[in-house]
Structure formats: C-alpha cells, structure tokens
Interface confidence: low
C-alpha cells in the first residue's frame, strides 16, 4: 500500500481554481525527493504536468505551480483557470519517475450552471440555516408574500404570509419582516439538507404586478479535511460546529457504507474498539470540542464525522464536520507491546517511547478514566510530583536522548488494572496507550526485603537486605530512595567478578543496604530493583521508619568504625574466593537514574532476557572507604 495520501475526488467549476494537497511519510529522503503531478492516459501511462524539479508542461504554463512543504511533509498543486478539459484521473507522487509512490486523484470540472440573470445564489453547509431576502415594491406591501421551490413543472409552496407551510419545512421555515421596512420580507430555513438545494422563487403580490425574485440555494457537504498520521501515533479531531449547537450533545462517528457509527459522544457512549485510547473534550461555550485517539491502528483509517444533536447520534439537517484519516504504516513510532501484565504485590516497568529529537521535552504518565467524556489525570511527570495515592510506589526514570523513558509502578493491586498513557509536552503524535493487567499472585514475589517491618533507630546502623532469585543473578541490583520527584539511585561500587550462575545458591542471593548512622532524613520509602544494562526490571518497596532510641535498647556498633558512608550497599554472594574488591565511587546521577530502554517484568520477559552477562553488576557504596561484606554459607 502506497504511503502517499491525498484527496480522492476534487471537484470545481470552469474558471475556478483548485489546490490539491498530497502527504508523504516523514523522512529526509522523502522531504527532498522529486514531487510530481501527472495525468493518467488510457494506456496507463502517466504524463508529467508539473514537478518539483521545475518542469512545467505547456498546458499548465502560467496557471499551475507545485510547492513542497518539507516541514509538514506535504506538497501542494495549485491549478487555476480550470476548463472541462481538465476533468480526468491524475496522480500525485514521489520519485525520480512517475512509477514511484503515488496516490490517485480524480478531478472533475463542471460547467457553470446557467441561471436566470437576476438569480441570487446562496451557498450554505449542511445543517446550517439560510435567510433569503425578498424585496418588493411598496404597492405590494398588503399582498400575500410567499416562497416556493421550483420542481420540473411547477413551483411548490414552502411558506407564505398566511402561515401556510409545506410539511417538509414545518419547524424549519419562518417568513418575517424586519422593523418598519415595508419593501423586503425574509424567509429563514434552518437545518438544511441536500434535499433543500435548488431553485426558489420569492413573490409578493399576484398577477403581472407581482414582485418576483429567483434564488439558487446550494447546500454543500463539508469538504473532508485530510489527516495523515503514523501507525501507533495519535490524532485529534478538532470540531467547531458553532454557537447554535453549543448546548447539544456532541459525537464523533466513522462512516460505514451508508451509516455513520458513533465512536464516542458526550452522553457516555463509546465504541469498545476505542476503550482506553479515546477522550472527548468540550473546548468552550461556542460548540467547539475535540476528540483525541491514541495508539492508532491500521483499521482506524477512514472517513470520520463530528456533529451535535440532543440524541448524541448523527441526524440529517444538523451541522457536521468531516475528516479523511490515513494511517501510514511506515511509522517512526516504535512497535512496543500495548499490554503489560503484572501480579498483585509485584511491579511493572513500562517503556514509554517519545520523539528522540525532543529529549528535553517533559514526560508524563496518566491514567485513562472512562467515566463521563473520558479524561487522563497525570500521575507522574518529569516536573510533576507523584500523586499522593501513589506515594512510595510510582516513579518516572528519564533517559535523555534515547527515545524512551521508564515508568515503574510497584505494590500492584487489582485496582491498578486499566489503561495508561505515555505523553510529552512535545510531539503529540507520540502519545501511546498501555493496558495494564493485574492478576492475583500465585507464588512468592521474586524480590523480598528483610526485615519487613523496618524501623531504624536514630544514630545507629541499620541494614536491610533484598533477596533475589538466581534468574536475576547476571543483572545489576540497585537500591534507590523514593521521593515524589523520583527514585534517587544510590551510588555503587564494583563488586568484581562473580561466581558462575551455574553454582547459584537460591537461598543466599541478596543485596544489602546499610544506613550508618541513621538520621531523621533517612525515613521514607526505599526500592530494591534489578536492571539489565539500560533496561529496568522488577522492583519491591519498603518503608523505613526512624525512631529515637528508647531506654534499654542496645547500641549497635558500625561494622567499620572509620566508615564515613551514609549508605553502604553490598552484593552478598556465596563464593568466598571473591576477596579483592575494587571500590569505585560513582558520581551522583541526580534525581533520576539515566537508564534507557525498558521492558515490563510481569510475565516471562525477564526470564527470556536474563542472559549470562556475569561480572557486570555493580555492588554499591557511598564512599570508597566503606566495605561491608557478609558472606553466607
């Protein structure tokens, strides 16, 4: 399927001009390659009429141009002074030859309709209203006024001043006069439909002295706006229907043969196919609203329509706006899994993609709520503090320049199941949707912290240990201190080479954190976690309370009297042959660890990925003088 997109059908009238926009995928090659417009002949050949290389055919000389807009990946063909000879099949495309990527466009140029010379033309959109002005001479002021619609043979009454109204115009047509002006009457017709288009005659008086005026009413379907979006990206339908429908229910529907199936409306209806990835947002009191859809799929391509009606459903004669959405499968947005699985008490690490060219953009994570019109309150962001109800169990790790940031949620409950969105304040196309599924845990968690009821005593030494299974052996372990601005990874030192995972003793794998001496600032949430290179895995959390020493409590001496370190982290292993430890002080990485791509660890992903990268894990210590090594046998 060609990734080039444009209008399928373009119509105009003789002497007018058209402007045809064609879209192409966002690549530098496409931005700079030749763009062309050619006419298809009976033989299948497509003859170039104009190209971005400067070629212009004789028949287009002086009346056409082609402009490339590389910044929004479109090019526009403008053609003026149209004649009926311009009717035909065309292609807009990219490439050095006319056999490159292209899109078929049908252009139809009609004759200007012949109307009586005094005809007044009114052009209105479907669903809107028209006020027809009917002047008359003063002597016809007392006479009957009327408006009729011309049919083949006769003129069928619409409305007259005796309050006679054609049944199909009841409630829609009004005949009135303004103020004291006795030389003009008006007919207003509301909720216009295609059937209302045609020739009308307004008349005041009877017989040869009657005043008559010819009126041509054209009722147009709105021209669909073209939207070109990448697979997995997001789209916003901005709907502006006008003040007259400000208080009506709003909807967005997708054309399906003859009907338009409602996808979402402001009365709470929502198509299950869009669950978790759609919001409808009223913009203001003027009838404006927008619908945002994330995680675009191939099957989302098509013809969309927004409208307003008290039923929240499409109704003939009510204003509409339309779009043609094209979903480009050559997407720049990486294919990540859209469902992440976790278990109660466990954790998930979610990789959120963003446009790598916007590494400095602010990153956010929000939870999609389906009630009402749908909304997505932000739970955490690079400059947004974690929401209170997620205290101690949610953090966002930003890796500038990489194109991925990571959100970790632990202490999972079944309440956490639902849809979440990754978004930034930059390129809105990169909004992505994740469905989090949480199953009841059927086994012990992979990471376990002891002691579980952690109360540290002020001024003393306090150690917590994080036990991990052998399958995490080759991965880095870390402790971090959680705050509502993130989880501050505690610096580490290299523990040196380790035993091979073949001889891993399931009962003795642990990484410990020592607070020495304990201070009041140490109180709070701490996480123990695993990661492989730039990929975060499981985490578990513990709250450490800090209390004053009560009488009778024993004073615990620090393991190393010279230790200046506030926190020492140790990798505890069975192999006592590891005697030489090289301590490496790592500069503080700031409030967020600079980690890159991440996959969720709630299902099998972790096991599939834990390959034997032995010797790469970091033990952790705040200063080079602190070494606490406990060997368990």
């Amino acid at each position: 399927k060609s990734p080039i997109f444009g209008p399928q059908e373009v119509s105009s009238i003789e002497g007018d001009s058209v402007s045809i926009t064609c879209y192409y995928p966002d690549t530098s090659v496409n931005r700079h390659t030749r763009k062309y417009w050619c006419r298809q002949g009976a033989s299948g050949m497509c003859t170039t009429l104009i190209s971005s290389n400067g070629y212009l055919s004789k028949e287009y000389s002086g009346r056409a141009n082609l402009i490339n807009f590389p910044e929004n990946n479109t090019f526009v063909i403008n053609i003026e002074q149209l004649t009926q000879d311009d009717t035909g099949s065309y292609k807009c495309g990219l490439g050095t030859s006319n056999r490159g990527l292209s899109f078929d466009v049908s252009l139809e140029v009609s004759q200007v309709p012949e109307l009586p010379s005094d005809t007044h033309v009114y052009t209105k959109d479907i669903g809107r209203n028209v006020t027809i002005e009917c002047p008359f001479k003063r002597e016809n002021a007392p006479s009957k006024k009327s408006l009729c619609k011309k049919t083949n043979q006769s003129c069928e009454l619409v409305i007259d001043s005796t309050e006679k109204v054609n049944p199909s115009y009841i409630g829609r047509a009004k005949l009135f006069m303004k103020g004291t002006d006795l030389t003009v009457f008006y007919v207003n017709i509301s909720h216009l439909t295609h059937n209302d288009a045609g020739l009308y005659i307004c008349q005041a008086g009877e017989g040869p002295s009657a005043d008559k005026k010819n009126v041509d009413l054209q009722v147009l379907a709105p021209e669909p706006e073209l939207l070109y979006k990448d697979l997995r990206s997001s789209v916003t339908f901005e709907c502006d229907l006008g003040r007259e429908v400000a208080n009506e229910a709003k909807y967005l529907c997708r054309m399906n043969k003859e009907t338009c199936d409602v996808i979402i409306n402001t009365l709470g209806k929502r198509d299950p196919d869009f669950e978790g990835r759609i919001l409808i947002t009223p913009k203001d009191d003027n009838g404006r609203f927008s619908v945002l859809i994330t995680g675009l799929r191939k099957e989302d391509a098509g013809h969309y329509q927004c409208g307003a009606h008290s039923s929240g459903l499409p109704q003939e004669g009510w204003p509409i706006q339309t779009w043609q959405l094209f979903v480009n499968e050559e997407s720049t947005i990486p294919n990540r899994r859209s469902v992440v699985k976790g278990v109660t008490g466990g954790s998930v690490a979610i990789a959120c993609p963003y446009n790598p060219k916007e590494s400095s953009s602010l990153k956010y994570w929000c939870r999609w709520e389906g009630d009402g019109n749908g909304h997505c309150p932000v739970l955490v962001g690079t400059q947004a503090q974690v929401q209170e109800e997620y205290e101690g169990r949610l953090a966002l790790f930003d890796q500038p320049g990489n194109g991925t940031y990571t959100v970790i949620l632990n202490q999972l409950t079944t309440e956490d199941a639902g849809f979440y969105w990754c978004l930034t304040n930059g390129d809105s196309r990169w909004r992505t949707t994740i469905e989090l599924q949480v199953a009841e845990a059927t086994r012990e968690p992979n990471l376990e912290v002891t002691p579980q009821n952690a109360t540290a005593v002020l001024g003393e030494t306090f150690t917590v240990s994080c036990h991990y299974p052998c399958k995490f052996y080759s991965q880095e372990k870390y402790w971090c201190k959680w705050s509502n601005k993130g989880c501050h990874i505690l610096p580490s030192h290299d523990e040196g080479a380790r035993q091979s995972s073949v001889s891993c003793d399931q009962s003795s794998q642990l990484v410990s954190m020592t607070l020495n001496p304990v201070s009041k600032e140490d109180e709070g949430w701490y996480w123990c976690g695993v990661k492989q290179g730039q990929t975060y895995g499981e985490t578990t959390a513990i709250y450490i309370a800090v209390e004053e020493r009560t009488r009778g409590s024993s004073h615990v001496n620090p393991t190393d009297a010279n230790a200046r370190a506030k926190v020492a982290l140790e990798e505890e292993v069975v192999d006592s042959s590891i005697s030489e430890k090289e301590n490496k002080a790592i500069p503080n990485p700031g409030p967020f660890a600079n980690e890159r791509e991440i996959q969720n660890v709630g299902d099998q992903a972790q096991e599939n990925r834990a390959s034997g990268d032995a010797g790469s894990a970091d033990g952790q210590s705040r200063s080079s003088s602190s070494k606490h090594h406990h060997h368990h046998h």
Epitope: E71, T236, E358, S361, L362, G426, D427, R429
Partner: nanobody
C-alpha cells in the same frame, strides 16, 4: 505565546551580501524545523531554505550555492547568509519555525512579520 523576529534586511547592490537573523522567543519547550521563505511582489510565498529537525539543510534550486542557512539551537535562532545577491532575490523574507510551547502539546507553525531585502543598483 511565541514570537519570531527577523532582522538584517535592507538595500544591497547586485553581487552584494546580507545576513538575516530570526530569533524565536516566548514559552518555548522545543523547536523542530526552522526555515526561511520569501515572497516577491505579486508572487506566492516560496521556500528558500530549511534547517530540518535532524540537522539536514535543504535549499531552493534558485539559491543553491549562494545562500547558507545555519542555526543556534541554544538561542532558538536561525540565520540566512545571502551571497552573490541578484535582483531576482528582491522579496520580503519570512522566518518560519515549528514550535512546541510549554502549555500546549504538539508542534505548531509560527511565522515572523518579515524583513524586506531589495537588490538594486
């Protein structure tokens, strides 16, 4: 809001040179493409040069080899060095930038008010 302010236009003789500057200011979160367009009297506005999001540059055929576009990302500023100017280069030069603001997700096109370049002897 975002403002783009062009400067550096003026009257110059054929064969001469000028350097245009355009600075973007306001509540800017991120700037993607920055470009120069021009519009000669009675003609449509056309692309002169673009400094694309990936750092690539692109020039209209008529200015290749004579004009150079450059950019200072830290200052959100784009420059157009115009050498060997010809009378056909006479036009209003407009700066264009795709900008994401702090308060609105997504990029939008912003335009400057233009600076006039006249090449005449």
């Amino acid at each position: 809001e975002v403002q783009l302010v062009e400067s550096g236009g003026g009257l110059v003789q054929p064969g001469g040179q000028l350097r245009l500057s355009c600075a973007a200011s306001g509540s800017i979160a991120s700037v993607r493409d920055m470009a120069w367009y021009r519009q000669a009297p009675g003609k449509q506005r056309g692309l002169v040069a673009i400094f694309a999001r990936g750092g690539t540059t692109h020039y209209a055929d008529s200015v290749k080899g004579r004009f150079t576009i450059s950019r200072d990302n830290a200052k959100n500023t784009v420059y157009l060095q115009m050498n060997s100017l010809e009378p056909e280069d006479t036009a209003a030069y407009y700066c264009n930038a795709e900008v994401a603001t702090m308060f609105q997700p997504g990029f939008r096109d912003y335009w400057g008010r233009g600076t006039l370049v006249t090449v005449s002897s």
